[in-house]
């Protein structure tokens, strides 16, 4: 017999989500208006295309990338969409309140939506570590806390360290990874006997996860270049990201084969390692002066990703209860750190090249920025984890982890689904 959504959650989720949606509508009604200045159509279309790329990355790319579980593929895709839709709404309001509110009303532009989509992407990266172990009501909490934490982090970094939009947002990799890992650490870990098969991957869902990886691979240059100010910066960012992800694909596939005793290629390694280069060059994608450097970074990132996928899952599964196929969290944490270190190296070179005695101070500022991102991620992640453990959310029982049947109505239940 199909397992039903627990009665209490059936009552609590619609009420909680719809009340929240009504509150958001009211906030939009009272505090926002559209940008009234007349922007020409060509400019609008170009600006919208960037936002569209980001939405495709979020909805299709990350949605399908997390859908490789044998019995949790529907939930992965749909819950991702739900979180994206909710996250974008809250991020638009929050960014507006934090940056424009003293002037009276929040002006919504296409750029606001672009920023909000990127903020919501953070949640989609983090949630990979907990998908299958939480219900939608809990995910709503996670969206609200993470988007709020990231928005505040960006504002603090912008005000204290005076960084631009791009540098500010590129902490997203490290932030999202550590947030997700700390939430996972708080959730019940052991899978009871008889449910181990559910967190295994299956061929068709793995194919859809590969489709997600392909979409992310195609649009990663748009993500890395979306917030840059000048055409030359965007051009360099697109080129360098493309070279880096191209090399990380080759590295991922060959490295995966190398890591296997029989030379076989692991789907899980490939899913995440193809993106490695894009994450590693993110912070400095517009600054890398020549293609070969971006390619070397892609190679190093691919190797780190495959190495991480081979040796870290055991530790992550034991300590954090993260299934073997959910490797985005620790992958992004390592690669995000690599990206930040590369930027610090560039900063040192810049300061040294200027014959400037203030290297230590500059490096200290950058490390401070990175540390702040990690600390806020860990603290807000732990807070979220503690909130998600509250009884009111009626979290799925451990026996119902990674199970679409808990959440979805299937017209017929085929054996073995």
């Amino acid at each position: 017999m199909s397992s039903k959504y627990p009665r209490s959650v059936r009552r609590c989720l619609p009420l909680w989500a719809l009340t929240l949606e009504a509150a958001l509508i009211l906030l939009f009604y009272f505090f926002t208006h559209y940008d009234a200045s007349l922007e020409d159509q060509k400019g609008l279309v170009a600006s919208y295309q960037v936002g569209q790329d980001l939405t495709v990355m979020a909805a299709i790319g990350l949605g399908f990338l997390t859908s490789s579980f044998r019995r949790h593929s529907w939930s992965s895709v749909a819950f991702n969409l739900f979180m994206l839709a909710l996250g974008v709404q809250w991020a638009i309001l929050l960014d507006g309140f934090l940056s424009q509110f003293p002037s009276g009303k929040v002006v919504i532009t296409l750029f606001s939506i672009r920023l909000a989509t990127m903020s919501a992407l953070s949640v989609l990266i983090s949630v990979d570590a907990v998908l299958g172990k939480v219900n939608l009501a809990q995910l709503v909490v996670m969206v609200l806390v993470e988007v709020t934490a990231l928005g505040n982090l960006r504002m603090v970094i912008s005000n204290i360290f005076n960084t631009d939009y791009h540098m500010n947002m590129m902490h997203i990799y490290v932030f999202a990874a550590y947030f997700g890992l700390s939430v996972a650490w708080c959730l019940p870990k052991p899978l009871p006997e008889g449910t181990e098969d559910k967190d295994q991957t299956a061929t068709i869902p793995s194919l859809s996860a590969m489709l997600g990886a392909l979409f992310l691979w195609m649009f990663w240059p748009s993500f890395n270049s979306a917030l840059l100010r000048s055409p030359i910066e965007r051009k360099n960012a697109v080129f360098n990201t493309y070279y880096a992800v191209a090399v990380s694909v080759v590295t991922a596939i060959s490295g995966s084969s190398l890591a296997h005793p029989q030379g076989k290629i692991s789907k899980t390694y490939v899913h995440s390692a193809v993106l490695a280069g894009g994450v590693a060059v993110g912070t400095s994608c517009h600054l890398i002066p020549s293609p070969w450097l971006a390619m070397v970074l892609g190679l190093v990132a691919g190797l780190i990703s495959v190495g991480g996928a081979k040796y870290l899952p055991g530790c992550c599964n034991r300590v954090l209860g993260i299934p073997h196929s959910s490797i985005m969290g620790y992958n992004f944490s390592l690669l995000g750190l690599l990206g930040e270190i590369i930027y610090i190296v560039l900063l040192v070179l810049d300061t040294v090249g200027a014959g400037n005695g203030m290297i230590g101070f500059q490096v200290l500022l950058s490390i401070g920025e990175l540390s702040l991102a990690i600390v806020i991620a860990l603290m807000s992640g732990l807070l979220t984890g503690l909130l998600l453990n509250l009884k009111i959310w009626k979290a799925p029982h451990e026996a119902k982890y990674f199970d679409d049947q808990v959440f979805w109505k299937f017209p017929h239940l085929a054996v073995g689904f």
């Epitope: 600006s47 296409l110 000048s230 030359i232 360099n236 600054l287 900063l347 300061t351 203030m358």
Partner: antibody, heavy 125, light 106 residues
Amino acid sequence: QVKLLESGGGVVQPGGSLRLSCEASGFALRSSGMHWVRQAPGKGLEWVALIWFDGSIRSYAESVKGRFTISRDTSKNTLYLQMRSLSADDTAVYYCARDKAVRGISRYNYYMDVWGKGTTVTVSS
Amino acid sequence: VMTQSPSSLSASVGDRVTITCRASQNIIRYLNWYQQKPGKAPRLLIYGASTLQSGVPSRFSGSGSGTDFTLTISSLQPEDFATYYCQQSYRTPPFTFGPGTKVEIK
């Protein structure tokens, strides 16, 4: 030849409005960020506003935030500055300038490489 | 905040002139210099602390890093009598200009 030509200046009463235009020739506005910079009589240069090359971001000096709006029409290759609630402090020569970027090592260096001749705005009763 | 010294100076044709610009915090080499003649628009001279803009005579040079920068005119010409502004581009916006240094004929 790359050129910028401002127009629309004049005398306006306090609390009044004015729209300045800056026509660009020799390059496309859609591929360049643009600034407005002003200079009060006998004073130095003060940055007023910036619009990104794709029109996605507009930044303003604190002194004009909420009163001035920078915009552009790429089909006319023209930049605008809509000024509202003007006061005597806004009396100045207003210049438009092109935003240019060159890669440094740890960030880009931005500068204003092409300037218009300026248009004078006088706020007086 | 950007400060310039001196606020004005008098010099003769052929003199070597040095103008100093100080930033309130480390801006590495992200500094530009502009020249403005009376009644005219500003003109870019140097960007990135030391790179000469095309079309600018080689007698102009820029140096410095961190918080202290200098603009040097090796041999002052009659057309160089003007006001010179420095502008930081490390933390933008806002785009902060120095108060200017007026170079007058002695």
